[in-house]
């Protein structure tokens, strides 16, 4: 078969490289006195998203409907990818996070052009919405770099509430204490493959 591939937003950098790049970029920005808050992403990273238990996240989008599957992917199937856009938090946080000098790293997650994951705090649900930039706050998540190469996504609009897995679906999950930050159902893995 003849294949011709070209993927937008291809980045060779791994996740750890990105965290290092953030530190360098913030440092350079501080030296040069330029602002890098929130308007455009610091960097972008294309990754497949899976749970702590290695279930894949698949985005089934149509024009008028969508479904987000959390499931064991078949061996021969390729994983969906999300475009993670990294932003520096405009509001320095006192929490122990993964930013530099108290600043938090935030991300937006997009499975396809013009669509982003949104937090619906009233329904405790994770939704996909088509929208234009600037994105609403509901599309931003504070990124926490957890143990075992895992990350978690905390709602910008509702601190202490994280994207998690409930009944084989993505949902918003309230985390009561810092000890529960390592609970498996809010941990996700990012992979370039």
């Amino acid at each position: 078969m003849h294949h011709h591939h070209h993927h937008h937003h291809h980045h060779a950098a791994g996740l750890n490289d990105i965290f290092e790049a953030q530190k360098i970029e913030w440092h350079e920005a501080a030296i040069e006195g330029r602002s890098i808050t929130g308007i455009s992403p610091i960097t972008e990273y294309l990754a497949s998203l899976s749970t702590y238990n290695d279930q894949s996240i698949t985005f089934a989008l149509e024009d008028e409907s969508y479904e987000i599957y959390v499931e064991d992917l078949k061996k021969d199937e390729k994983k969906d990818k999300v475009l993670l856009s990294y932003y520096e938090s405009q509001h320095p946080s006192n929490e122990s996070g993964d930013g530099v000098d108290g600043k938090m790293l935030m991300v937006t997650l997009s499975p396809t052009k013009d669509f982003w994951l949104h937090a619906n705090n009233k329904e405790h649900s994770v939704e996909l919405h088509k929208c234009e930039k600037p994105l609403p706050d509901q599309a931003f998540f504070v990124l926490h770099n957890m143990h075992s190469n895992c990350v978690s996504f905390e709602c910008k609009t509702d601190p202490g509430v994280f994207i998690g897995v409930k009944d084989n679906h993505l949902a918003l999950i309230k985390v009561d204490s810092s000890e529960n930050l390592c609970t498996e159902n809010i941990l996700f893995k990012l992979s370039e493959t």
Partner: antibody
């Protein structure tokens, strides 16, 4: 309502060329990968070609590789199949088909053939 | 190239259950889809991702897939279900169809 309308079929001599078109409506055309599938008279379905992003991810079945070219014009909501060096065995009804789901950043086809057009007949004969 | 094998024909009495198989190497490692085609009409997707039904497809259509065989099951078969049925998979961004099965409702 998703609608796919093929055109451009007809009678052509062996070695000749045809360009098929598929006009799409009722959905965001640019967001979906598209395919061409054909069916020879009294025979089964045969996948021919698929395309994801504009010109950047194209896929072909071996029997048509090097002779057929798939393309799309998102501004016109239209899918094309340029068929050159046609052979008698290319005689078939050609269907345009849309992926069931929108494209993903992983690229390529996803769950193809969710929606089909009515088909256009191509006859290659001297 | 990848080959999917279907029985050429299957017969069933009205109200009974019809099963149509589709065999391929390590079929269970792929997601199967099923298409219904009535004479003179375009194909219609009836099952995708092994078991899922698109909106508008009756509940009597179901699917399964494991090992080397995917199966389309039609429970309480009706006369209107008489058609050709094709299985299909996506393999490395190329489509593959089975040869088709003619379902006859006696």
């Amino acid at each position: 309502e998703v609608q796919l309308l093929e055109s451009g079929g007809g009678l052509v001599q062996p070695g000749g060329s045809l360009r098929l078109s598929c006009a799409a409506s009722g959905f965001t055309f640019s967001s979906y990968a598209m395919s061409w599938v054909r069916q020879a008279p009294g025979k089964g379905l045969e996948w021919v070609s698929g395309i994801a992003d504009d010109f950047t991810s194209t896929y072909y079945a071996d029997p048509v590789k090097g002779r057929f070219t798939i393309s799309r014009d998102n501004s016109k909501n239209t899918l094309y199949l340029q068929m050159n060096s046609l052979r008698a065995e290319d005689t078939a009804v050609y269907y345009c088909a849309r992926d069931l789901w929108m494209m993903n950043y992983a690229g390529g086809l996803r769950y193809p053939f969710g929606y089909w057009g009515q088909g256009t007949m191509v006859t290659v004969s001297s | 190239s990848y080959v999917l094998t279907q029985p050429p024909s299957v017969s069933v009495s009205p109200g009974q259950t019809a099963s149509i198989t589709c065999s391929g190497e390590r079929m269970g490692d792929k997601y199967a889809a099923w298409y219904q085609q009535k004479p003179g009409q375009s194909p219609v997707l009836v099952i995708y991702r092994d078991t899922k039904r698109p909106s508008g497809i009756p509940e009597r259509f179901s699917g399964s897939n494991s090992g080397n065989t995917a199966t389309l099951t039609i429970s309480g078969t009706q006369a209107m279900d008489e058609a050709d049925y094709y299985c299909g998979v996506l393999k490395q961004d190329t489509g593959v169809f089975g040869g088709g099965t003619k379902l006859t409702v006696l």
